[in-house]
């Protein structure tokens, strides 16, 4: 499956919606911030075969359009960068699902590497905790913010390096 | 490989205006801040202030509040350091360098080779 | 502001000594202080991060422990490359600052 030019494009447009999100001053917030162990071996696209990439992109994806779909998110963002940046991320989610369906009949590994997608999950998961235990602080979510602009990046080198596969 | 590369040494007079520079390259320039760093002749580090290049937002040490102006402009992925009117106590060397923001990551990981500033009459 | 008090400012240590420096900030900042190398005309080089995490590249002779308001660099084993100033750095609070800077020369 070749992910369409247009699914870079949407990462690169979630990003920037990501980075015009801020609503206080991130300079207040540096004690706040806070080691969630991105599991950056997951987003190494030479140890995958090329489903299992894809796969780690969709639960990367997927938890990430999660996590800003909730109420708490949306009485933190301004309410229209916030649905156009999960639009952004539906698309994309869009895009890799068609991807993981060709893929399947492609490879005869297993689709789903079910430690990587743990571990995306088990990130998400501390990402969550955070925000709990922080009360969903307006630093709490601006590091929370800050963390999914790193691991989107990693998500579009690795759907670079998928492209160079090709 | 990720650099910062700073303009080169300056002679000036007391009274007159300078702007250095601090070039960023091998990185996502706007997902760093840059922070700028004193050091006079015999001394020690002293952190001057920080700019966000994503947005432009800026913070200066009290010490350096009104005395000097922190800019960045994305497009050319470099930042700036200047003052509108040179003191013979500005006479140090200067060093951008990058830092991660909120990311859990190391701070001030990479610096600029410093530029000499040379105020004298 | 944060201040932060490096001793000793100066040491005169040998090759293979096991050296310590210590870092007190005038109030915590949990673990977010940093560790800086400096040779003469050269800019600064970051060695440890979050008070004990070793950057890339930095030799495991160095390393950083403490949290709160009391830090250590150690140096296992002096090297000749070794002979520098070193900084602490807290990344707490803004505004940042930095030890007055402790000089590590050859006995």
């Known amino acids: 499956c070749d992910l369409p030019q247009t699914h870079s494009l949407g990462n690169r447009r979630a990003l920037i919606l990501l980075g015009q999100m801020g609503r206080i001053s991130p300079f207040s917030c540096l004690k706040d911030r806070h080691d969630f162990r991105i599991p950056q071996e997951e987003f190494d696209g030479n140890q995958f075969q090329k489903a299992q990439a894809i796969s780690v992109l969709h639960e990367m994806i997927q938890q990430t359009f999660n996590l800003f779909s909730t109420e708490d998110s949306s009485a933190a963002w301004e309410q229209s960068l916030l649905e156009k940046f999960s639009t952004e991320l539906y698309q994309q989610l869009n895009d890799l699902e068609a991807c993981v369906i060709q893929e399947v009949g492609v490879e005869e590994t297993p689709l789903m590497n079910e430690d990587s997608i743990l571990a995306v999950r088990k990130y998400f998961q501390r990402i969550t905790l955070y925000l709990i235990e922080r009360k969903y602080s307006p630093c709490a979510w601006e590091v929370v913010r800050a963390e999914i602009m790193r691991s989107l990046s990693f998500s579009t080198n690795l759907q670079k390096r998928l492209r160079r596969k090709d | 490989e990720v650099q910062l590369v700073q303009s080169g040494a300056e002679v000036k007079k007391p009274g007159e205006s300078l702007k250095i520079s601090c070039k960023g390259s091998?990185?996502?320039?706007?997902?760093?801040?840059i922070g700028w760093v004193r050091q006079m002749p015999g001394k020690g580090l002293e952190w001057m202030g920080i700019i966000d290049p994503s947005d432009s937002d800026t913070r200066y040490s009290p010490s350096f509040q009104g005395q000097v102006t922190i800019s960045a402009d994305k497009s050319i992925s470099t930042a700036y350091l200047q003052w509108s009117s040179l003191k013979a106590s500005d006479t140090a060397m200067y060093y951008c360098?990058?830092?991660?923001?909120?990311?859990?990551?190391?701070?001030?990981?990479?610096w600029g080779q410093g530029t000499l500033v040379t105020v004298s009459s | 502001d944060i201040q932060m008090t490096q001793s000793p400012s100066s040491l005169s240590a040998s090759v293979g000594d096991r050296v310590t420096i210590t870092c007190r900030a005038s109030q915590s900042i949990d673990d977010f202080l940093n560790w800086y190398q400096q040779k003469p005309g050269k800019a600064p080089k970051l060695l440890i991060y979050?008070?004990?995490s070793l950057q890339s590249g930095v030799p495991s002779r160095f390393s950083g422990s403490g949290s709160g308001t009391d830090f250590t660099l150690t140096i296992s084993s002096l090297q000749p490359e070794d002979f520098a100033t070193y900084y602490c750095?807290?990344?707490?609070?803004?505004?940042?600052?930095f030890g007055q800077g402790t000089k590590v020369e050859i006995k």
């Open positions: 979050f008070a004990s």
């Open positions: 750095q807290q990344s707490h609070t803004l505004p940042l600052t």
């Open positions: 360098a990058r830092h991660p923001g909120l990311a859990w990551a190391p701070d001030f990981d990479y």
């Open positions: 091998g990185y996502s320039f706007t997902s760093y801040w």
